[in-house]
Structures are given as C-alpha cells and as structure tokens.
Amino acid sequence: DAGVIQSPRHEVTEMGQEVTLRCKPISGHNSLFWYRQTMMRGLELLIYFNNNVPIDDSGMPEDRFSAKMPNASFSTLKIQPSEPRDSAVYFCASSL
C-alpha cells in the first residue's frame, strides 16, 4: 500500500507567485494534516481536516495561505502571494 503522496517534491518560485502543493492521503484515512518545518521555527501544524472538513486552520492566520480537501483522496495547500519566508519543507500526513 502506497504511503502519503505529495507533489511536487521540490518547488522553486519567485516572490509574489502562486504556489500549489498537492497531497494524496493513505486510502481509508479520514484525517489529513499539513505541516511546515523550518530551522528557525521548527515544525508547525498549519491545518487539519477530518472527513474533508477543516477542523483547525489556526496555524495559517495569513490569508495568503489556503487549503482545500474536495474529496477523501486529495488536498491542496495554496500560497498566494508567496514570500521568501515561506521557504520551508511542507509535509502532508494522514491518519485514521
């Protein structure tokens, strides 16, 4: 069984451009989480969904960030406009 699948693996963009990250959770998992990790700030929970419904998006108070989960097998995290300080590793995770 495949694990959580994210794309793209790497993204380089100019400041001000829109960035869209995609995630496919493990089949049968009903919770999905987006995290951000940097050296300076550590691991931050951005948002999590349960049964496709956003439960807590308090980790992304800037309205440049938006996340959607249109169905049980797909989620996106969008940054518009992007800023240099958004440079980080973004993780998607899922759980039962």
């Epitope: 807590d56 308090s58 980790g59 800037e62 309205d63």
Partner: antibody, heavy 117, light 106 residues
Amino acid sequence: EVQLVESGGGLVQPGGSLRLSCAASGFTFSRTGMHWVRQAPGKGLEWVSYISSGSSTILYADTLKGRFTISRDNSKNTLYLQMNSLRAEDTAVYYCARRGEGAMDYWGQGTTVTVSS
Amino acid sequence: DNQLTQSPSFLSASVGDRVTITCRASKSVNYAYWYQQKPGKAPKLLIYYTSNLAPGVPSRFSGSGSGNEYTLTISSLQPEDFATYYCQQFTSSPFVFGQGTKLEIK
C-alpha cells in the same frame, strides 16, 4: 455565548513586568487561534501578537519581539501575554481577541496597563 | 511591513447620508477586514474577506475592493453608526490596522 475576559493590568514602573490573562469560554478554545491587540490612550488599534491553537505558530509585531511573550494553557482555556522591560509607550488598553472569519470576530472588554514612575 | 492608510481620518455626516471610507495598502493584499469601535468599548467585526457581513451586522454596511484599495460603505447612516472605523489586513504578518476614521454627527 463566546466570552473573553482579560485581567492582570495595572500600574507598573518603567522596566517592570506584567502578565496579562484572557479567560475564554463559550467555544472550543483548544482549536482556536488567539490575538492580543492594544490601544494607547486616544490612539488607534495596534496588533501585538498571535498564537495558534497548539502554540506551534507564534507571531509578534516587529517592535515588540524580545520583550513580549504570548502563550496559552488549553487545559485552563486561558491566553497569556508576558510583558517585560515595560516602557511608558506600552501604556494602553490590551484586548484579547478570537481568530474567526479570518479576522478577529470576538473581543474581550480590555485590561488597562499603565507604565509610569 | 505593509501600511494601511484610511481616508478620510475624520468625517462629518448626517443621519440618512451615504458614506464611504477608503483603505489603501502600500502593498497589495488579498482581503480587507473592517471593525467598528465606540468610545470605551471593544472593537466589533463588521466585514470579513472584503465583502462578507459579520453576523448581526445590518445590511446597510457593505465592503468592496481589491489589491491596494478597499472601501467600507454605509448606505444610510443611523444614529448608532457614529463611531470610529478601522481596516485591517491578514495577508502577511504583522497584521496592521489602518489609523482609523472617526465618523461624527454633522
């Protein structure tokens, strides 16, 4: 009914410290981001700090970094603002506010901080 | 940091008037948010995501705009609308407010 009640304000000397509290009720505090905002006498609103539900995301106004520390205790439904090295210009009414509708949808009544010798 | 400039800073108007307050951002923002504050009271959210009315806010209030310029309009002023109004942005931290617009009775 959403309620936010600030406390801990008072008169403090320059260089002193104060810890403000904000007791929350009527909503799921442990899933909600919270802000501190202040208003100096006769002046406009100034955003101070933000903390996410689990405290992993914390933001400050640039001018206050290093002196002010935001924190929360979800088991007590309480938000805090620790203020150190206080200056006369920190004199203000301090409000806590709930993050909602992408903004600040509920506010407390405020607590007054006066920094004076 | 972004700067929000409201105009006018002071506005005298009469009951029944239509008034518009403008909020200009030094850098483009995704949305504007508007608050009303009366003397000695906490601010109250009026408009979120540029044009959405907060619960309980009368329909005479409306918001519009995009990019660097946003407006709050009151279609027919009522006595209880005389207050100070603030815009705010959440596109990028720090979450600055405009300096405020004081709406007074003419």
